[in-house]
């Protein structure tokens, strides 16, 4: 089941999936001056079986001006630099993505891909948030969001993260006030059947990741 919306936006933060659940789709898009080859795929799809998951289809771009110049190679470092994705800025090496069953790792870049990747997530997907450079995290809970199915509708849980500028001194007095639930909603609202496939395994993953995501920023 596709998530109806995108993950929530947190001011001065970016999100990233560490692995993509089977069923996730990625737009095949090209940067300005290039277009998908005519017979090329519109989307990549994370598919697999119980033992192995991988991305079906390949995205291929060709110059808008010249025809039939289709190459499938990894961009040079300077090309990669300009890609504005939802990837986090600081280097992190969390849990091995391949170790999560039923998930695909980040697809490798394709030549002349667009500067932003558009993913279409499925229920059970978890994304992790980190403050952008120049901002620091004030935690009130997990800095992650999960796409859940509730009452037949999909929604993303609210990440408990505030990003504040380094110069700001307001420390939110009494910051550690407990929340009613991780989503910041009363439990009564979410008491019906909730589908969160792989939630436990990803929560454990998040716990091991917590250190790597939020310490690299200040080293």
């Amino acid at each position: 089941e596709l998530c109806d919306d995108d993950p929530p936006e947190i001011p001065h933060a970016t999100f990233k999936a560490m692995a993509y659940k089977e069923g996730t789709m990625l737009n095949c898009e090209c940067k300005r001056g290039f277009r998908r080859i005519k017979s090329g795929s519109l989307y990549m799809l994370c598919t697999g079986n119980s033992s192995h998951s991988s991305w079906d289809n390949q995205c291929q771009c060709t110059s808008s001006a010249t025809r039939n110049t289709t190459k499938q190679v990894t961009p040079q470092p300077e090309e990669q630099k300009e890609r504005k994705t939802t990837e986090m800025q600081s280097p992190m090496q969390p849990v091995d993505q391949a170790s999560l069953p039923g998930h695909c790792r980040e697809p490798p870049p394709w030549e002349n891909e667009a500067t932003e990747r558009i993913y279409h997530f499925v229920v059970g997907q978890m994304v992790y948030y980190q403050c952008v450079q120049g901002y620091r995290a004030l935690h009130r809970g997990p800095a992650e969001s999960v796409c859940k199915m509730t009452h037949g509708k999909t929604r993303w849980t609210q990440p408990q993260l505030i990003c504040t500028g380094e110069m700001e001194t307001s420390q939110f007095p009494g910051e550690e006030k407990p929340q009613a639930s991780p989503e910041g909603r009363p439990e009564s609202e979410t008491s019906c059947l909730v589908t969160t496939t792989d939630f436990q395994i990803q929560t454990e993953m998040a716990a091991t990741m917590e250190t790597s995501i939020f310490t690299t920023e200040y080293q």
Epitope: D4, M25, N27, E29, Y43, L45, I118, H120
Partner: nanobody
Framework: EVQLVESGGGLVQPGGSLRLSCAAS????????MAWYRQAPGKQRELVAT???????TYADSVKGRFTISRDNAKNTVYLQMNSLRPEDTAVYYC?????WGQGTQVTVSS
């Protein structure tokens, strides 16, 4: 889930025009690459035209210069303007986004 509903098909004479519409719901429309496919009796479904999020378009050689795909993100709708229609354009036309398909709309070009 994405719901797609096509409209605008019908019977038209060779050389005539039709405008197909496809209304999408259930997902943020502006994030979707939209496509029109068609399937003639006894033939495989073929890609007619696509439109990216930024408006970039691609067409099958057989319709280039005659068909125009466009989108209105405010209305969550994609269009296929078909001019100079030929008998060989007769088919059921399907709207597509992600792995989702509309029910199809019949286009018949005949005198």
């Amino acid at each position: 889930e994405v719901q797609l509903v096509e409209s605008g098909g019908g019977l038209v004479q060779p050389g005539g025009s039709l405008r197909l519409s496809c209304a999408a719901s259930g997902r943020k429309f502006s994030t979707l690459i939209m496509a029109w496919y068609r399937q003639a009796p006894g033939k495989q479904r073929e890609l007619v035209a696509t439109i990216e999020r930024d408006g970039t378009t691609t067409y099958a050689d057989s319709v280039k210069g005659r068909f125009t795909i466009s989108r209105d993100n405010a209305k969550n709708t994609v269009y296929l303007q078909m001019n100079s229609l030929r008998p060989e354009d007769t088919a059921v036309y399907y709207c597509n986004a992600l792995q989702y398909w509309g029910q199809g709309t019949q286009v018949t070009v005949s005198s």
